[in-house]
């Protein structure tokens, strides 16, 4: 998958993929931080949530996010039996009924209130990277990842495999 031009045909199938089952295979709470150890925080402002990327003061509590992991099964593919079909998808919810959404038109990451079943914009393909970091690729737009831009989360297009290790799309998960 990896959202890279050489395998776009493969990743594009994510557009048509269905989430197998309606319940996640596992879920747990974790704090989200950038490769450079800045925290991702969520603040309620004027009845909507804002997302910030910031340095926390010493002993300041990190915001937790509920990560729900699903298996994505591609529809029938060349090999015929779904062997290419399993990707690990994740949704991220910092507070009840709100989920991170990819707004591909605005290249932004937003918090939307919604009911299940969640829209495709709330699902991200999880990639394990070096140094135990992860990256989040938009299900609706392969090759586009959640990243950090100007102290905010944004959608960032990654157009070559070398750029997959770019620090601004790498995140750390911590349960503590």
């Amino acid at each position: 998958a990896f959202g890279i031009s050489g395998v776009q045909k493969y990743t594009r199938a994510l557009h048509d993929s269905s989430i197998t089952g309606i319940s996640p295979i596992t879920e747990y709470l974790a704090s989200l931080s950038t490769y450079n150890d800045q925290s991702i925080t969520f603040a309620l402002e004027d009845e909507s949530y804002e997302i910030y990327v910031e340095d926390l003061k010493k002993d300041e509590k990190k915001d937790k996010v509920l990560l729900s992991y699903y298996e994505s099964q591609h529809p029938s593919n060349e090999s015929g039996d779904g062997v290419d079909g399993k990707m690990l998808m994740v949704t991220l919810s910092p507070t009840k009924d709100f989920w991170l959404h990819a707004n591909n038109k605005e290249h932004s990451v937003e918090l939307h209130k919604c009911e299940k079943p969640l829209p495709d914009q709330a699902f991200f393909v999880l990639h394990n990277m070096h140094s135990n970091c992860v990256s989040f690729e938009c299900k609706t737009d392969p090759g586009v990842f959640i990243g950090v831009k100007d102290n905010h989360l944004a959608l960032i297009k990654v157009d070559s495999s070398e750029n997959l290790c770019t620090e601004n799309i790498l995140f750390k998960l911590s349960e503590t």
Epitope: A1, F2, I4, G6, V7, Y10, T11, I25, T26, Y28, Y69, E71, S79, V83, D84, K86, M87, L88, V125, L126, H127, N128, H130, S131, N132, S161, E162, L164, C165, E175
Partner: antibody
């Protein structure tokens, strides 16, 4: 169906290098990380590292960092693991494996090669 | 590195018995644990992933449970082909590490 077929058994002298191949078929080779493990006779399993066949990016276990090189040839859907400066305690069966998920190791190793016995003896 | 401690290292049981193998991680690994069965001279075979999800094609007598640091593989009713070695593996963080193995032997 998915198959990982490894090269045959090797006998090497201490100090030499060995290169094991793993030919993948039945799936999109560039869509899944490839992992390498080894198992010494009568012992448990040990993870050595992984390669992203799409980018060529690698990640090695600290223990093997200075002796292992993982490469791939996408044109023939084959991954390689080369271990240099062999010692007698490198005698083991070496396995390649594909993860359950394309780019995440969270789901464990779903498909394995048949294993390649490497014997290091003077 | 995360150490995986499997117990017991061996267990004697009879066909039809219920067998439980435990695996403890030296630090929390959420639910990212896999269980494998390995027969002599063969590659390991994935039984359980994400601590409790049964791999396709694996008989339902195998089940997994646990989260955090403590995990269990249960074989509800041992069959003759189940007498072999089982490994747990943490799939949470690098380096990926395996337990030392549990050999299930015929009593």
């Amino acid at each position: 169906q998915v198959q990982l077929v490894q090269s045959g058994a090797e006998v090497k002298k201490p100090g030499a290098s060995v290169k094991v191949s793993c030919k993948a078929s039945g799936y999109t080779f560039t869509g899944h990380y490839m992992y390498w493990m080894r198992q010494a006779p009568g012992q448990g399993l040990e993870w050595m590292g992984w390669i992203n066949p799409n980018s060529g990016g690698t990640n090695y276990a600290q223990k093997f960092q200075d002796r292992v090189t993982m490469t791939r040839d996408t044109s023939i859907s084959t991954a390689y693991m080369e271990l240099s400066r062999l010692r007698s305690d490198d005698t083991a069966v070496y396995y390649c494996a594909r993860g359950r998920y394309g780019s995440s190791w969270y789901g464990g190793f779903e498909y394995w090669g048949q294993g390649t016995l490497v014997t290091v003896s003077s | 590195d995360i150490q995986m401690t499997q117990s017991p290292s061996s267990v004697s049981a009879s066909v039809g018995d219920r067998v439980t193998i435990t695996c403890r991680a030296s630090q929390g690994i959420t639910s990212w644990l896999a269980w494998y069965q390995q027969k002599p001279g063969k590659a390991p075979n994935l039984l359980i992933y994400a601590a409790a999800s049964l791999q396709s094609g694996v008989p339902s007598r195998f089940s997994g449970s646990g989260s955090g640091t403590d995990f269990t593989l249960t074989i509800s009713s041992l069959q003759p082909e189940d007498f072999t070695t089982y490994y747990c593996q943490q799939a949470y963080s690098l380096p990926l590490t395996f337990g030392g193995g549990t050999k299930v032997e015929i009593k």
